[in-house]
């Protein structure tokens, strides 16, 4: 049986099938006659009962509320009610990244030590009966693997294995084709005693902004205790009074390394802040790694249709 949705806060990507499963499912079967209701509330709207008539995209099955697919306007709080049992979820539906085969905010980061075993298996237990094909991509390039149903990588890690692995499941429902993407950011580290510091996320980031508004550029890295993380911008740092480097935050990982985060806050964005590089660098005895941010006026961000899957 598929596990229930126990996490109270959930982020999903628009356009994908999605489901909520309440956690008193076995109980619900025992009391078939009991009234079971699903509700949604968002903003000014108070509890609105959901049923298949609410939307052609919504389906109710026993313990599950399904979305075919989930869309941005599905963001809100959801409730399941049965007798004196209530379960609540807060759902945040985010925009799909149309420039890539995956959406950055929906990436699961994993650290693998070099020469240690790891396995990526493209499986989706809830939708498996509906999936008619599945592809595995590395950095948005399709990997040619034997198994078309559950593509799998099983190996001892090498440094060249580092990258973004996206499992894309293609499925049909009511005559329509959908896809579900699950992406892992695999970071290969030397060993637990000494890692090569790495900045998390893409090397080049275009950030859509509005003039006069504020923006926070977050730079995160996996590093050793003695490594440093810093921002570089303009001819000399500090020349722009609207730019502030916030205090660095560090959290120790279970394997004794550090996850550091440093935010660059740009207030009252002006023309001079657009189309220039804001560089974040992590430095250690083993070398440096840099990622760049470029602020782009919202209107200038072209909407490229379709997914960027390369074969």
């Amino acid at each position: 049986a598929e596990s229930c949705t126990s996490r109270p806060h959930i982020t999903v990507v628009e356009g994908e099938p999605f489901y909520l499963k309440h956690c008193s499912c076995s109980l619900a079967h025992e009391i078939e006659t009991t009234t079971k209701s699903w509700y949604k509330s968002s903003g000014s709207q108070e509890h609105v009962e959901l049923n298949p008539r609410s939307s052609s995209r919504i389906a109710l099955h026993d313990c599950v509320l399904e979305f075919w697919p989930v869309e941005l306007n599905d963001t809100g709080s959801y409730f399941f009610q049965m007798k004196n049992y209530t379960q609540k979820w807060k759902l945040n539906v985010i925009r799909r990244n149309k420039h890539s085969c995956f959406t950055e905010r929906q990436v699961t980061s994993k650290i693998v030590e070099v020469k240690k075993f790891f396995q990526i298996t493209c499986e989706n237990s809830y939708y498996q009966t509906l999936v008619n094909s599945t592809s595995l991509y590395k950095n948005c390039k399709k990997l040619l693997l034997e198994n078309n149903k559950n593509p799998t990588i099983k190996k001892n890690a090498e440094f060249e294995d580092q990258g973004y692995y996206s499992c894309v499941h293609f499925l049909h429902h009511n005559g329509k084709l959908f896809n579900i993407t699950k992406t892992f950011n695999i970071t290969i580290v030397e060993d637990r005693s000494n890692i090569v510091p790495v900045l998390l996320g893409p090397k080049l980031n275009h950030v859509a902004v509005e003039l006069g508004k504020n923006v926070r550029l977050n730079c995160s890295a996996l590093l050793n205790e003695e490594d440093v993380i810093y921002w570089m911008f303009g001819e000399e740092n500090g020349s722009d009074p609207n730019i502030h480097e916030e205090k660095e935050m560090r959290i120790m990982t279970p394997e004794g390394k550090w996850h550091a985060s440093k935010v660059l806050r740009i207030e009252n964005i002006g023309e001079s802040n657009l189309n220039v590089l804001y560089n974040c660098t992590v430095a250690s005895t083993g070398g440096t790694d840099t990622k760049s941010f470029i602020l782009v006026r919202k209107a200038d961000m072209a909407d490229i249709p379709g997914h960027v899957f390369t074969r």
Epitope: E2, S3, C4, S6, C23, T108, K110, I111, V112, E113, K116, F117, F118, Q119, I120, T121, C122, E123, N124, S125, C167, K182, F184, V189, T253, P254, E255
Partner: nanobody, 127 residues
């Protein structure tokens, strides 16, 4: 979030046995999570002991130092994962942690792959 609780630790003579349990609180169903047992001895790095994958526990892993002595298993009815430790040695002395990872599709037995951790239970093996 997932909350894990280890139990079953204690003091035992070399050659003896212990069974550690890892239970989840609330509505979390452990059968949908990869579970790992890790240990940390004073002054040493945390190391992997044994791991079991989700989806029916099809994959298991044992560190070389415990192969043939330790067994990892699931009891889905009781929402618990066990680590049966036989023929214990003084070098098995450590704090034992259980950890869970719900990232369906990825599996490894390294602490960097696990997102949720218990508080740990002390195992002391006297000679």
């Amino acid at each position: 979030d997932v909350q894990l609780q280890e139990s079953g630790g204690g003091l035992v003579q070399a050659g003896g046995s212990l069974r550690l349990s890892c239970a989840a609180s609330g509505f979390t169903l452990l059968d949908s999570y990869d579970i790992g047992w890790f240990r940390q001895a004073p002054g040493k790095k945390r190391e992997e002991v044994s791991c079991i994958s989700s989806s029916g526990g099809k994959s298991t892993y044992y560190a070389d130092s415990v192969k043939g002595r330790f067994t990892i298993s699931r009891d889905n009815a009781n929402n618990t994962v066990y680590l049966q430790m036989n023929s214990l040695k003084p070098e098995d002395t450590a704090v034992y942690y259980c950890a869970a990872d719900g990232a369906e599709g990825f599996w490894s037995c390294q602490s960097g792959g696990y997102d949720y951790w218990g508080q740990g239970t002390q195992v002391t093996v006297s000679s």
